[in-house]
Amino acid sequence: CDLPQTHSLGSRRTLMLLAQMRRISLFSCLKDRHDFGFPQEEFGNQFQKAETIPVLHEMIQQIFNLFSTKDSSAAWDETLLDKFYTELYQQLNDLEACVIQGVGVTETPLMKEDSILAVRKYFQRITLYLKEKKYSPCAWEVVRAEIMRSFSLSTNLQESLRSKE
C-alpha cells in the first residue's frame, strides 16, 4: 500500500497547526516539563511498513482522542482545533485504507500489539499529567509541545518508510 503524497502533506499541515495552537511559551513553564517516555523504539527503523502502519494509526487516533475532549476545547482556539481534527481524520483514513488492503494485518501480530499498548500507555501518562496539573495553561503547553515532538518523530518514520521503497 502506498500512502498518498497528500498524507505526507497532511502530516506537515498537522505540525503547522500544532505550532499555531500555541498560546504561551514553554519558556514560561520550564518547571512543568515532564518526561512522558515517548516509546520511540516502537517507531524504529527495524520495522517493516506492515508493522508500522497500525502503530502510526494508534498514535494519530490517540492524538485525536486527547485533543477532542471538553478540557481540550476550553484550552485551544476552536477554529484551529477544527482544522486539526480534519487533518488527523484524513490521516486516519489514509492509514485505514492501507490496513483494509491487508497491509499490517498478517505479520507479527504480537509485536504490533505490544507496540500499540506502549503507545496507549504513553497517552495514558499524558492524560494523567494533565489531570494532576488541573489542565493548567502550562500543562497544556507542555503536552502540545510533547505531541508536536513525538508526532514529528513518527512523521520522520513515515518519510523513511516511503524512501526505502
Epitope: S25, F27, L30, D35, R149
Partner: antibody, heavy 122, light 107 residues
C-alpha cells in the same frame, strides 16, 4: 530559512550606553522566547538575558539593573538596551532562540545570529 | 544558580580517535542538558539536546549520555572538522548556565 541578524554593536566608553537589535525571519517570532548570550574575547559563553513570548523578562545577576531586554513582535525584532556599561561587558553578543520541535521542548538553543561585537573601552 | 563544570578544559587528539568530554551540574537537572560546538570566529551550533538527542543534521559520530548531574559527549571517530571548542549548557532553570568549554586540538 530561520535567521537572526544582530546589529548595533560598536565601541563605547565605560558608563556609556548602547542598544543592540536582532531582526528575526523564517519563523513565528511572537511565539518564541528570545535570548541574548555573550562571549568575551577568548572566553566562554555566558547567558545574559531572555524575554518570554508573553513579555516576561529574565537577567543574569551580572547585568541586572543595567540591561533591559524588549521585543517588538510587529517588527520581528529583539532589543537589548545596555546602560552603565563596564569594561567587562566587552564581548560578542548573540541573539538566540529555541525553534525546532525537539529543541523547543528541551530549550536547546538551536538558532543563533552571527553576533555583534561590543567594545567598552576608554 | 546551577554551576556547570566541564572537563577537561583542553584535549589533544588525532583524526580517527574516540573522544569523551564530561560535564557536571551542581544539582540535579534531569536530562535538560545541551551540547554545542563552536569553531573559531563562528557562532555556536547545537549538537545535542535533552542530554542524548541528536540535533537534525548533526553527524551520528556525536552522541550524548547521562542524567541527573553527570553527562558525557562522545565523538566516536574524530574528523578534521571536529576540532573546535565544545560547551555544555543546562536548560533546567533560569539563569541558563554554560560549562567553561573544552578546546579540542589536533595532536
Amino acid at each position: 530559512e530561520v535567521q537572526l541578524l544582530e546589529s548595533g554593536g560598536g565601541l563605547v566608553q565605560p558608563g556609556g550606553s548602547l542598544r543592540l537589535s536582532c531582526a528575526a525571519s523564517g519563523f513565528t517570532f511572537s511565539s518564541y522566547a528570545m535570548h541574548w548570550v555573550r562571549q568575551a574575547p577568548g572566553k566562554g559563553l555566558e547567558w545574559v538575558s531572555a524575554i518570554g513570548a508573553g513579555g516576561g523578562t529574565y537577567y543574569a545577576d551580572s547585568v541586572k539593573g543595567r540591561f533591559t531586554i524588549s521585543r517588538d513582535d510587529s517588527k520581528n525584532t529583539l532589543y537589548l538596551q545596555m546602560n552603565s556599561l563596564k569594561t567587562e561587558d566587552t564581548a560578542v553578543y548573540y541573539c538566540v532562540s529555541s525553534v525546532g520541535a525537539g529543541a523547543y521542548y528541551y530549550q536547546g538553543l538551536d538558532v543563533w545570529g552571527q553576533g555583534t561585537l561590543v567594545t567598552v573601552s576608554s | 544558580d546551577i554551576q556547570m563544570t566541564q572537563s577537561p578544559s583542553s584535549l589533544s587528539a588525532s583524526v580517527g580517535d574516540r573522544v569523551t568530554i564530561t560535564c557536571r551540574a551542581s544539582q540535579d537537572i534531569f536530562t535538560y542538558l545541551n551540547w554545542y560546538q563552536q569553531r573559531p570566529g563562528k557562532a555556536p551550533k547545537l549538537l545535542i539536546y535533552d542530554a542524548s538527542r541528536l540535533q537534525t543534521g548533526v553527524p551520528s559520530r556525536f552522541s550524548g549520555s547521562g542524567s541527573g548531574t553527570d553527562f558525557t559527549l562522545t565523538i566516536s571517530s574524530l574528523q578534521p572538522e571536529d576540532f573546535a571548542t565544545y560547551y555544555c549548557q543546562q536548560s533546567y532553570s533560569i539563569p541558563y548556565t554554560f560549562g567553561q568549554g573544552t578546546k579540542l586540538e589536533i595532536k
